[in-house]
Interface confidence: low
């Protein structure tokens, strides 16, 4: 009742503002996760208060909706292409500044923050929707919800509802910020067949950091991890003229691998970086399997290799390599081109002089912390040299250590050579980051994985050829199907495994599909289509990096059109919220921050927005306008 709410508000209000509810609802259908975060805040004070709606979302997610409701008025986000949106900013403010609400935050998250003036005795509701496709890593999918309300919340709830057609094989939830006993009391988790459910609904007293405290325990990551049953090798979903094919076969033998590590030993690696790199290499070498072959290449001003050709990972060789790692010292400049070409040459020798190793999975891993400064330093020339030397034979994984690396360049190089780039953050856990990356590629199960679909049935398709498939991961292909081709749709998969060819055909089980649609209804159709759109946009954005200007414009316009069609905030679109502005007349905007976007302070002053319907009318005298509080109350799941 109203009065009990008022009575309770005394305990939890900060400066007269209390959070009536903060709810995170996550619905997952076949790896496609749809999140809605809703927060209702009440200003019980007799003067205006500033409140902040503040949360973190995964970098991999796309925001798709934002709305603010206050005093019966709804203020809704509107997605436009960036260019149009930018023109509107210019009209709004001579300064040409924008009032962005999203910025990069830490390694994996982005922070969404809006500050809003709320009238006395009023309530405001914020609602943010975002979506992502969950990636399988280390044999599980992970849903991460950052929790950090800056005060106690009357009704706090995280509700995760999972529907996986293959069936759920395991489900877990952890709240690292809670004592174990309290976590056990407050987190309810259950799964059976296709459905899984996690509910976290702590009472106000369970949120308190101590029995008499008004501070909250809720501060950290709430993680839900799960995996699906893999009894059936085929996992092919077809709905509403779209398909999603999930490929992660079990019980395959690990392939032997040929791996060459190319390591930057220039002067800038001194101190903790080289120590952590050595530490990681020592551990990685210790994890090598006897059937693996390897070598090490170091590049500074000069390029040196340990052996100059692949050697078996025997105990004696591994010990000698570890001694080599412990003993190497740093050089001065960065001959990246020379180091890479030497590493490629060693792997290419397999074709010519070590044919018995040609059925192994070859992998090249390069680590650098800076720009090329020695030998060939022109980036486009290096890209060309590497492309011409590898010729698609094996993947190149680039690890960029620290802030001073041209990560864009490393990404393009990896993408051009069937690999990917990963940033290694200069931090106390860099050793674990390096090991963590290696563990993802340490167990190749298949190479040259080709997923084929009937040509006459497919109108659009995401990437369907993968150089390698690793243990614990998953290959996902999605696409659009032509009318009347759903029932005859199928998938053929071919690949090479350890000492065998791998080949399967997956057909659509129409009866099963009908049953799934009955169980999950419209959401299944919607999620399969949005999964395809999400993956397609991600791929188009990634491809843009490695093509010429004309092709880039073409890819951009495709990605833009899809972003607008599906209402995603991507690097090409911008969401502005009508009906609110700050003191400079700027509208708040929601943009996808770039990997290296500056922190909020560098984007100009913090902006507080006023909903136009709430602004004092011009007839009020200036003495009557409400003063903003000195203190800010945060409603914060950041």
């Amino acid at each position: 009742s109203k009065s009990s709410e008022k009575r309770q508000a005394v305990d939890t209000a900060v400066d007269g503002v209390f959070i009536r509810s903060l709810k995170v609802n996550c619905k997952v259908t076949s790896r496609f996760a749809h999140y809605v975060v809703t927060s209702q805040v009440v200003n019980t004070a007799n003067e205006a208060r500033e409140v902040a709606f503040d949360l973190e979302i995964p970098k991999t997610a796309f925001i798709s909706d934002f709305a603010v409701t206050a005093d019966g008025n709804a203020f809704i986000g509107d997605i436009k292409d960036k260019v149009t949106a930018w023109k509107q900013y210019r009209k709004a403010a001579i300064s040409g500044e924008n009032a962005g609400l999203v910025r990069a935050s830490g390694r994996t998250m982005e922070q969404f923050t809006i500050h809003l003036t709320v009238n006395p005795q009023s309530k405001v509701t914020f609602q943010l929707t975002y979506e992502e496709v969950l990636k399988r890593n280390h044999m599980q999918y992970e849903i991460v919800i950052k929790v950090k309300p800056k005060q106690l919340v009357h009704h706090f709830e995280i509700d995760v509802d999972i529907f996986e057609p293959q069936g759920i094989s395991k489900l877990d939830a952890q709240a690292s910020f809670l004592p174990k006993e309290l976590a056990a009391q407050t987190i309810k988790k259950s799964f059976s067949g296709k459905k899984g459910h996690v509910l976290f609904r702590p009472t106000v007293s369970q949120q308190q950091s101590c029995p008499t405290c008004s501070t909250s325990l809720l501060n950290g990551h709430f993680k839900v991890t799960y995996d699906v049953s893999r009894d059936k090798i085929c996992d092919l979903l077809v709905a509403n003229n779209h398909f999603a094919h999930f490929f992660a076969p079990q019980n395959l033998t690990n392939m032997n691998k040929n791996v060459v590590f190319v390591i930057d030993i220039s002067g800038s690696m001194r101190g903790q970086k080289v120590k952590q790199t050595k530490e990681a290499l020592l551990k990685i070498l210790g994890d090598m399997q006897p059937g693996d072959y390897f070598d090490l290449v170091l590049f500074g001003t000069r390029v040196q290799s340990w052996k100059g050709s692949l050697v078996q990972a025997s105990e004696a060789n591994l010990q000698a390599a570890q001694d080599f790692v412990r003993g190497f010292s740093l050089d001065e400049a960065t001959n990246l081109n020379g180091g890479l070409l030497r590493g490629i040459e060693i792997l290419n020798q397999v074709q010519e002089s070590l044919p018995e190793l040609s059925n192994h999975a070859s992998i090249l891993i390069m680590l650098t912390d800076g720009d090329p400064t020695e030998g060939v330093t022109d980036r486009s020339q290096i890209l060309k040299n590497v492309r011409n030397a590898i010729r698609g034979r094996f993947p190149l994984y680039n690890l960029g250590f620290g802030h001073n690396v041209d990560f864009n360049f490393l990404e393009v190089m990896s993408m051009e050579n069937n690999g990917r780039a990963q940033r290694i953050y200069e931090d106390h856990d860099a050793t674990q980051q390096l090991q963590g990356f290696y563990s993802q590629v340490a167990k190749p199960l298949l190479v040259d994985v080709d997923l084929q679909y009937p040509q006459d049935a497919v109108l659009a398709l995401t990437q369907n050829h993968h150089k390698q498939y690793y243990e614990g991961s998953e290959i996902v292909v999605a696409g659009r199907i032509a009318d009347n081709k759903q029932s005859s749709f199928k998938a053929d998969v071919q690949a090479h495994g350890e000492g065998q060819e791998f080949s399967i055909t997956c057909l659509v089980d129409e009866e099963e599909m009908k049953k799934l649609l009955r169980e999950r209804g419209h959401m299944l159709e919607n999620h399969v289509e949005r999964l395809w759109a999400y993956l397609t946009i991600q791929e188009l954005l990634a491809k843009r990096m490695k093509v010429d200007r004309e092709e880039r414009a073409n890819l951009s316009s495709q990605a833009l059109q899809m972003s607008l069609d599906y209402g995603f905030v991507t690097p090409l679109t911008s969401m502005s919220i009508r009906g609110m502005a700050d003191q400079d007349g700027l509208k708040p905007t929601i943009d996808k921050p770039s990997e290296d976007s500056p922190p909020l302070e560098m984007l100009g002053p913090r902006r507080t927005f006023v909903l136009s319907a709430l602004q004092p009318s011009p007839t009020h005298s200036s003495s009557n306008t409400q003063r903003l509080p000195d203190r800010v109350t945060g409603v914060d799941t950041d």
């Epitope: 101190g271 903790q272 856990d429």
Partner: antibody
Framework: EVQLQQSGTVLARPGASVKMSCRAS????????MHWVKQRPGQGLEWIGS????????NYNQKFKGKAKLTAVTSASTAYMELSSLTNEDSAVYYC???????????WGQGTLVTVSA | DIVMTQSPASLAVSLGQRATISCRAS??????????MHWYQQKPGQPPKLLIK???NLESGVPARFSGSGSGTDFTLNIHPVEEEDSATYYC?????????FGGGTKLEIK
């Protein structure tokens, strides 16, 4: 060269507030946590709290919540600590120190002496 | 909070001999890769000076007679051979979590 320059000695009355500063130079101020440490005469070191000027995130030792308030002005590369409701127990030298994940507390200010006396 | 217990509280060592200072944490402050333990030297009227970081890494410019060891909960600072200028108070400190805490200090006197 990294330097942390702290404001001078302060004499204050019980119940009053003081605000001391720590001006940083020789590095990117917004990229490192700035911590504050208290040392009473002849005693050990006690951690008060920290601020990340890049986004004004703060952490406090439970013991100093309500006593110390940390702020930073990035344009001036200066961190501040305000101590309120002073008592004799607050008489101490207060140090600011920069924390880098690969270096620990490698750089310290020279300290600000606060004496609380009626 | 993690409690750091340093021993002894004071120590007198002859010039050229070895000084050993111990520090025990109330819980482990190590992973398989790192120990989040640091040692500082403080002389009267001066701020602390970092000597050893991450249990065993000598800070640049610190003489090689200082060394650190240990992992988990037990750590040691060794000074050998002790010199006149080493007369000071030594503190251990963990950076495992917030709040980082310091040991009570060990006062080293040179005989």
């Amino acid at each position: 060269e990294v330097q942390l320059q702290q404001s001078g000695t302060v004499l204050a009355r019980p119940g009053a507030s003081v605000k001391m500063s720590c001006r940083a130079s020789g590095y990117s101020f917004t990229s490192y946590w700035m911590h504050w440490v208290k040392q009473r005469p002849g005693q050990g070191l006690e951690w008060i709290g920290s601020i990340y000027p890049g986004n004004t995130d703060t952490n406090y030792n439970q013991k100093f919540k309500g006593k110390a308030k940390l702020t930073a002005v990035t344009s001036a590369s200066t961190a501040y600590m305000e101590l309120s409701s002073l008592t004799n127990e607050d008489s101490a030298v207060y140090y600011c120190t920069r924390y880098g994940t690969s270096e620990g507390f490698a750089y310290w200010g020279q300290g600000t002496l606060v004496t609380v006396s009626a | 909070d993690i409690v750091m217990t340093q021993s002894p509280a004071s120590l007198a060592v002859s010039l050229g001999q070895r000084a050993t200072i111990s520090c025990r944490a109330s819980q482990s402050v190590s992973t398989s890769s790192y120990s989040y333990m640091h040692w500082y030297q403080q002389k009267p009227g001066q701020p602390p000076k970092l000597l050893i970081k991450y249990a065993s890494n000598l800070e640049s410019g610190v003489p090689a007679r200082f060394s650190g060891s240990g992992s988990g909960t037990d750590f040691t600072l060794n000074i050998h051979p002790v010199e006149e200028e080493d007369s000071a108070t030594y503190y251990c400190q963990h950076s495992w979590e917030i709040p980082p805490t310091f040991g009570g200090g060990t006062k080293l006197e040179i005989k």
